[in-house]
């Protein structure tokens, strides 16, 4: 069971990143699915290595003082959402913006029906060029 | 099937990074090989988690305006090369240069004879100290 | 065999990061253990994918000129410690400090009784908020 999906620019103002099965994507079988273009949902309980990579372009003057934060989040059936992993990068002083990349990854127990998704502080800063931003998992 | 190889400084001007089976490297068996010191080639079709870490030292004034970009690329038999993953970091203002690290990783389907390699915008900026820059894969 | 542990602030002045089995941690069975809150120790020989993520907050003026470095280190029975992976990030000019995240990961052969741990140049700069700093492994 494995998946690797590719970032997709979205007109939505939500902080949840959007993904697509496009380009060199992976969706090994129907035991993992991409739902609503935003979350990877697994059908089998078990340990999964889950990862995300987010490349963004920001400028200190044009951004809020808070850093750019990417969060890997979990929604389990019947449970509150929770943050699994977070990474933060201070905005660049480069103009018009400076690119930076964040990588998140870890091993987590998922229940049947659990979904994972990626949240960012400012989705408009995310880079969607080939290979820059992606999201995936593999069952151990 | 798993491999982990260690960066090697090169006098070549190519943007493809060079690797070696040295230090605490891994080469589990002959189903994965390091070819020409530059690419990991697999003999078996399947899903692989492929990763690379690149540490580099650059300075904004001494570098081009473009960011430092590391790309994980795929060459399949009879196919054009393609980018699997990329990460970008704007150059530091630290003098003489500021170190930064990039990590790439994802799950991809590889065909028999497929090769993966790592490309960077400026190989002269890559740090080759122990543990700073490495490249590997594991078959799921 | 898999583990994922969560960073813990420590009053110790050691450069070795402290970890805990808290929050959304993973400890699949007793073939991997967290020892003294600082190292993951495995009982079985084999290939392991080992990873760490460290988020830190630093300021160029308040820090030494040397970058922030995170190191993934190995201690095998009867052997000297050795560095497996390192990543470096130059300090930010943001005030009071600028957050940055480092991710390390690779495949390594571990012997029975081998321990892995994470070293940083300044543990006081490490961010311990939910999901920011974690450490884990999985047996291939």
């Amino acid at each position: 069971i494995a998946a690797h999906v590719i970032s997709e620019a979205s007109s939505k103002t939500t902080s949840v990143l959007q993904w697509a099965e496009k380009g060199y994507y992976t969706m090994s079988n129907n035991l993992v699915t991409l739902e609503n273009g935003k979350q990877l949902t697994v059908k089998r309980q078990g340990l999964y290595y889950i990862y995300a990579q987010v490349t963004f372009c920001s400028n200190r003057e044009a951004s809020s003082q808070a850093p750019f934060i990417a969060s890997l989040c979990l929604k389990s059936p019947g449970r509150f959402e929770r943050i699994l992993l977070r990474a933060a990068n201070t905005h660049s002083s480069a103009k018009p913006c400076g690119q930076q990349s964040i990588h998140l990854g870890g091993v987590f127990e998922l229940q049947p029906g659990a979904s994972v998704f990626v949240n960012v502080t400012d989705p408009s800063q995310v880079s969607h060029g080939t290979g820059f931003t992606s999201f995936g998992l593999l069952k151990l | 099937i798993a491999a982990h190889v260690i960066s090697e400084a090169s006098s070549k001007t190519t943007s493809v990074l060079q690797w070696a089976e040295k230090g605490y490297y891994t080469m589990s068996n002959n189903l994965v090989t390091l070819e020409n010191g530059k690419q990991l080639t697999v003999k078996r079709q399947g899903l692989y988690y492929i990763y690379a870490q690149v540490t580099f030292c650059s300075n904004r004034e001494a570098s081009s305006q473009a960011p430092f970009i590391a790309s994980l690329c795929l060459k399949s038999p009879g196919r054009f090369e393609r980018i699997l993953l990329r990460a970008a970091n704007t150059h530091s203002s630290a003098k003489p240069c500021g170190q930064q690290s990039i990590h790439l990783g994802g799950v991809f389907e590889l065909q028999p004879g497929a090769s993966v390699f790592v490309n960077v915008t400026d190989p002269s900026q890559v740090s080759h100290g122990t543990g700073f820059t490495s490249f590997g894969l594991l078959k799921l | 065999i898999a583990a994922h542990v969560i960073s813990e602030a420590s009053s110790k002045t050691t450069s070795v990061l402290q970890w805990a089995e808290k929050g959304y941690y993973t400890m699949s069975n007793n073939l991997v253990t967290l020892e003294n809150g600082k190292q993951l120790t495995v009982k079985r020989q084999g290939l392991y994918y080992i990873y760490a993520q460290v988020t830190f907050c630093s300021n160029r003026e308040a820090s030494s000129q040397a970058p922030f470095i995170a190191s993934l280190c190995l201690k095998s029975p009867g052997r000297f410690e050795r560095i497996l992976l390192r990543a470096a990030n130059t300090h930010s000019s943001a005030k009071p400090c600028g957050q940055q995240s480092i991710h390390l990961g690779g495949v390594f052969e571990l012997q029975p009784g081998a321990s892995v741990f994470v070293n940083v140049t300044d543990p006081s700069q490490v961010s311990h908020g939910t999901g920011f700093t974690s450490f884990g492994l999985l047996k291939l």
């Epitope: 949902t41 059936p77 019947g78 449970r79 509150f80 959402e81 029906g113 | - | 929050g23």
Partner: antibody, heavy 120, light 111 residues
Framework: DVQLQESGPGLVKPSQSLSLTCTVT?????????WNWIRQFPGNKLEWMGY???????SYNPSLKSRISLTRDTSKNQFFLQLNAVTTEDTATYYC?????????????WGAGTTVTVSS | DIVLTQSPASLTVSLGQRATISCKAS??????????LHWYQQKPGQPPKLLIY???YLESGIPARFSGSGSGTDFTLNIHPVEEEDAATYYC?????????FGGGTKLEIK
């Protein structure tokens, strides 16, 4: 506004099957949420029976597992309860209700309920 | 199954006073810092209505005179000041473990 409405026979004979329909308006049952059946016995005791999720997976109360089946018709935005081999003990008011699939299983929207009597 | 025991079975409270209803679980309904215990109000001929979820979170549209507290195995629903329209039966429900279970109910009368 989302609304749920139960329908089905008010009287069922012992040993037969009880079939109820919940029609949902104002929200697609395939978009999100878990869609539940809950019953209330004459003494007012409430019992959760089971759910079918937006993706079609089901979960049942173990006390009913051998007798219960939940299905749906997405084209009509309806979900169904079938309870086999009923006895007089199954006499109750049957409610359909919605609960967040991701989030605590509380029941935030209920139907008005339909009373079912099991009697020969 | 987790058994929820409500007390008292019934109570009478004067208008404007405080009503306190207890719900005790046979085992903890906490998970990872959150309490999976919810409260409902039911009036005759109507379905139950969600008041409080996760022990203390007020459902949208519910008056602030309703509040919930507790963790682990002991939970409380408070209504203050009680109004005439609060006459109803109140149920607690746990969702920490399958199957979801309900308490036996507490009937509140206003005098």
């Amino acid at each position: 506004d989302v609304q749920l409405q139960e329908s089905g026979p008010g009287l069922v004979k012992p040993s037969q099957s009880l079939s109820l329909t919940c029609t949902v308006t104002g929200y697609s049952i395939t978009s999100d949420y878990a869609w539940n059946w809950i019953r209330q016995f004459p003494g007012n005791k409430l019992e959760w029976m089971g759910y079918i999720t937006y993706s079609g997976t089901t979960s049942y109360n173990p006390s009913l597992k051998s007798r219960i089946s939940l299905t749906r018709d997405t084209s009509k935005n309806q979900f169904f309860l079938q309870l086999n081999a009923v006895t007089t003990e199954d006499t109750a008011t049957y409610y359909c209700a919605r609960s967040p699939y991701y989030g605590p299983w509380y029941f935030d929207v209920w139907g008005a309920g339909t009373t079912v009597t099991v009697s020969s | 199954d987790i058994v929820l025991t409500q007390s008292p079975a019934s109570l009478t409270v004067s208008l404007g006073q405080r009503a306190t209803i207890s719900c005790k679980a046979s085992q903890s309904v906490d998970y990872d810092g959150d309490s999976y215990l919810h409260w409902y109000q039911q009036k005759p001929g109507q379905p139950p209505k969600l008041l409080i979820y996760a022990a203390s979170y007020l459902e949208s549209g519910i008056p602030a005179r309703f509040s919930g507290s507790g963790s682990g195995t002991d939970f409380t629903l408070n209504i203050h000041p009680v109004e005439e329209e609060d006459a109803a039966t109140y149920y607690c429900q746990q969702s920490n473990e399958d199957p979801n279970t309900f308490g036996g109910g507490t009937k509140l009368e206003i005098k």
